[in-house]
Interface confidence: medium
Amino acid sequence: FERTRSLQDPCSNCPAGTFCDNNRNQICSPCPPNSFSSAGGQRTCDICRQCKGVFRTRKECSSTSNAECDCTPGFHCLGAGCSMCEQDCKQGQELTKKGCKDCCFGTFNDQKRGICRPWTNCSLDGKSVLVNGTKERDVVCGPSPADLSPGASSVTPPAPAREPGHSPQ
């Protein structure tokens, strides 16, 4: 199959990094600057992606591969292939339309991106709160009272049952 195609199509001999130049009797010409071909036999080279503004170059474009972008400090990638850069927030915050906002009570975010998530509801698993949650950290659940040996007790009393997303104060 490939052998017959090579006989039919002189362009199939052009390797990656070149293009089959119809203006020059179908000889293989190198890709011009800022372009690439990642497979052989191409009639044109593809334009390199340019990492401008809030994007920065993670991998330079070469004659055989496209550039790859990431984001400048203070921003993080979103979307396939880092198609967008989104502003970082501090831990304990989330990004809203009005900028970075502190997590509401009962929620936390331990990253510089993403949304605030509700503290774990220890009582749903029959456990007690060992360490209280903060804006930056989830609660730490301890063993259930039944798991404790006689005389032992948890740091805080068992959490009462409550709606998801709420936590003991």
Epitope: S12, A39, I47, A80
Partner: nanobody, 126 residues
Framework: EVQLLESGGGEVQPGGSLRLSCAAS????????MAWFRQAPGKEREFIGR????????DYVESVKGRFTISRDNAKNTLYLQMSSLRAEDTAVYYC???????????????????WGQGTLVTVKP
Amino acid sequence: EVQLLESGGGEVQPGGSLRLSCAASGWAFGNYGMAWFRQAPGKEREFIGRLAWNGGSTDYVESVKGRFTISRDNAKNTLYLQMSSLRAEDTAVYYCARQRSYSRYDIRTPQTYDYWGQGTLVTVKP
């Protein structure tokens, strides 16, 4: 998981038109070249055309130039094949395929592509 799903095939009369779609999921669609191939009964898979990652350059096989147009919408993760002036010899199963990030093979050979859809049948008959 990488997935490609073609749709839009069907039966059409000679001279008619069809638009095929290829919905991609599970990977960075906008970073890869994409191609359409077809396979008629008893024949080998044939390259139709290929579109660059950003839609900036295209390659077509001679037999479809001026009749078929490939386009893509990176926001919708979808590749399209607009077919017009269809002929009986265009009857085949049509496949979309993702171009490898590097291949030593010719752009028109199947080996240059690493993921394929399941195909959609196009029948051209009076």
